[in-house]
């Protein structure tokens, strides 16, 4: 008799794929645009990325460092009107994209949470949560919570409001901290909180260290749902050299949890390559005309248009990974087991019950390596086969779909492999 199927876990929408942050509407849209109406016109692009949620803003009125002139219920007229926002929400819903609103109060000021009047600010946030939930928002983000006194208790209160309205609403908190203990203390009292931090930014881009950071985090957080990013707001290129961007995309999409990206991460947008652009939020490169300041500074392969036409581009990889992440049970909610594969490598298995299983092998080093996969590290429920089919490689030149012998697996420098194999009873 066939074994009984394992009961599926309850899945919220943010469990099913990536979140996409647009902190700066003007930089994202470019060409002097930068409002909610213009963003509505970019929703088809977000759909093509298969992202599940858009983390937007902050877009509320904020007079720098002035509590009285900060209104979390009002949209800054530079970004549009409440009607524009409602229209964006409706269009996003039609395309199955959820909208998460950033309510970090003093985003234009010295301290994101003001240095005084904590209770006044907290009350404003509470009122804003209730107002925007009624307006149809799917969740909220608050950043720089290390600057918020008694953050844990405020987050717990805001979480109660959000969840009280509907279990289908999300609260994201962001911190600049990379310290695991600080992160855990924030998570402790907030069961369903999604926390973005700089935790992985200290990975130093080595396989061993990244493996140890990921496994420590997962062990420490137990069975709670995680999010994966390298910071609460910055681009991946702020932390990674170009040759590791593909590897990290593969990793972020295949770890257990919600991957969170910033606009431009999908094309490797890099502020340092665009002289005169704010490093805080460089202009999104839709095509070569997006950055007219310096003729020739932007080549087609740096842009959305150019990369969309190239199946080997970073953007094409992002789209493929996002698609796999949103439809494969083992990647959606499968178990995770990391195991040894040799120095410089990080490898793990994702598996769920009798569904197709996935093996990820990442070479962080700048030399080619043979993977010595130590299957003995794995539990019986996650054993490795002799061969697995190559679903994709982060480097061009491999024949996809071909079976690879796992004992003879060789990886190019900075190469990541995603392999699939069937469940075997």
């Amino acid at each position: 008799r066939a074994p009984r199927c394992r009961e599926l876990p309850a899945q919220k929408w943010w469990h099913t794929g990536a979140l996409y942050r647009i902190g700066d509407l003007q930089a994202f849209q470019g060409h002097g645009a930068g409002n909610l109406a213009g963003l509505k016109g970019r929703l088809d692009y977000l759909s093509s990325l298969k992202v599940k949620g858009l983390v937007l803003g902050p877009i509320h009125k904020n007079q720098k460092d002035d509590v009285a002139q900060t209104d979390l219920l009002q949209i800054d007229p530079n970004f549009g009107s409440k009607e524009d926002f409602d229209s964006l929400l409706q269009s996003a819903k039609k395309k199955s994209i959820r909208v998460i609103l950033d309510l970090t109060p003093n985003y234009r000021g010295e301290n994101s949470w003001f240095s005084t009047q904590v209770d006044t600010v907290a009350t404003k946030v509470k009122d804003a949560l209730e107002f925007w939930l009624q307006a149809g928002v799917d969740g909220f983000q608050v950043r720089d919570i290390e600057n918020l006194k008694d953050a844990s208790s405020f987050l717990a209160e805001w979480q109660n409001i959000t969840k009280g309205f509907s279990e289908d609403r999300l609260l994201i908190a962001g911190t600049n901290s990379s310290d695991l203990q600080q992160i855990l203390s924030l998570l402790e009292s907030n069961k369903d909180l999604l926390l973005t931090s700089s935790y992985l930014s200290d990975s130093g881009s080595t396989g061993e260290h990244t493996k140890s950071l990921v496994t420590q985090y997962l062990n420490a957080t137990g069975n709670r749902w995680c999010s994966w990013s390298l910071s609460q707001a910055r681009l991946l290129t702020s932390f990674l050299p170009a040759q590791l961007l593909r590897l990290y995309q593969l990793m972020l999409f295949t770890l257990p949890g919600t991957p969170v990206f910033s606009y431009g991460d999908e094309i490797g947008l890099d502020a340092a390559a665009l002289p005169g652009q704010p490093m805080e939020a460089p202009v999104m490169l839709w095509d070569e005309s997006s950055f007219p300041d310096i003729p020739g500074a932007v080549s087609a392969n740096m842009t959305v248009k150019g990369q969309s036409e190239d199946p080997g581009s970073l953007l094409s990889l992002f789209r493929r990974l996002s698609d796999q992440r949103s439809k494969e049970r083992s990647l959606l909610h499968g178990d995770f087991h990391a195991f040894s594969a040799g120095p410089g490598l990080f490898s793990y298995i994702r598996h769920w019950d009798q569904n197709e299983r996935f093996l990820v092998v990442l070479n962080f080093g700048d030399v080619g390596l043979s993977a010595g996969l130590q299957a003995s590290d794995l539990p019986a429920s996650a054993s490795l086969p002799a061969k697995a089919d190559l679903l994709l490689s982060t480097q061009p030149g491999r024949e996809e779909g071909s079976p690879l012998e796992l004992e003879r697996l060789k990886l190019e420098p900075h190469e990541g492999l995603l392999l699939r194999f069937p469940y075997a009873a």
Epitope: S198, D202, R234, P275, P278
Partner: antibody
Framework: EVQLVESGGDLVKPGGSLKLSCTAS????????MSWVRQTPEKRLEWVAY????????YFPDTVKGRFTISRDNAKNTLYLQMSSLKSEDTAMYYC????????????WGQGTLVTVSA | DIVMSQSPSSLAVSVGEKVTMSCKSS????????????LAWYQQKPGQSPKPLIY???TRESGIPDRFTGSGSGTDFTLTISSVKAEDLAVYYC?????????FGAGTKLELK
């Protein structure tokens, strides 16, 4: 009080190489982005290299790109600047500087180490 | 690259006098997304490394006396010392950190009359 101590400066011939070190103490080195800034004999300040906290991301101005590399050993709390194909215009006092978060402005500087490139 | 121009290149003052020095950038340093101005000021005394005075164009670094004031936004900036003390004699540099590469002005040297 944050402390940054540079070393390795020397007199070197054009075309030569040199490696500078900066030892950091009294702060969580591995969580800060770092830079090297130099000051020419004419007292002009010029940023020459950046490295992110984890060491993954590095930036250089065009004047040194391809000749200088920046690295760090977080276990040893040490920042490095490897300079090769040195030119006379690289003669300067080299400072290691801690950044404010990820913004390249510099609240903390070392005392500097002098590099002289001359035949 | 953003070019930073400082004037005057030197300034002779008497103790107790009010002094202002200027810094101009070749493009705006005001980022519209957060309304912050990405400009810093440093003081450098002979034989010492630069010391931070001001960041975000007008925020004093901790421990800096309130006689030092930074002002301006967009492309025109000013550092004012309300009443110069003998210990303020130094070279003052402005620096933009709006975009890569970060760039410095050539400095204004404050000397005694």
């Amino acid at each position: 009080e944050v402390q940054l101590v540079e070393s390795g400066g020397d007199l070197v011939k054009p075309g030569g190489s040199l490696k500078l070190s900066c030892t950091a103490s009294r702060f969580a080195f591995s969580t800060y982005d770092m830079s090297w800034v130099r000051q020419t004999p004419e007292k002009r300040l010029e940023w020459v290299a950046y490295i992110s906290s984890g060491g993954g991301s590095t930036y250089f101005p065009d004047t040194v790109k391809g000749r200088f590399t920046i690295s760090r050993d977080n276990a040893k709390n040490t920042l490095y600047l490897q300079m090769s194909s040195l030119k006379s215009e690289d003669t300067a006092m080299y400072y290691c500087a801690r950044q404010d978060g990820h913004y390249p402005w510099f609240p903390y500087w070392g005392q500097g180490t002098l590099v002289t490139v001359s035949a | 690259d953003i070019v930073m121009s400082q004037s005057p290149s030197s300034l002779a003052v008497s103790v107790g006098e009010k002094v202002t020095m200027s810094c101009k950038s070749s493009q705006s340093l005001l980022y519209s997304g957060n309304q912050k101005t990405y400009l810093a000021w440093y003081q450098q005394k002979p034989g010492q490394s630069p010391k931070p005075l001001i960041y975000w164009a007008s925020t004093r670094e901790s421990g800096i006396p309130d006689r030092f004031t930074g002002s301006g936004s967009g492309t025109d900036f000013t550092l004012t010392i309300s009443s110069v003390k003998a210990e303020d004699l130094a070279v003052y540099y402005c620096q933009q950190y709006y975009s890569y590469p970060p760039t410095f002005g050539a400095g204004t040297k404050l000397e005694l009359k």
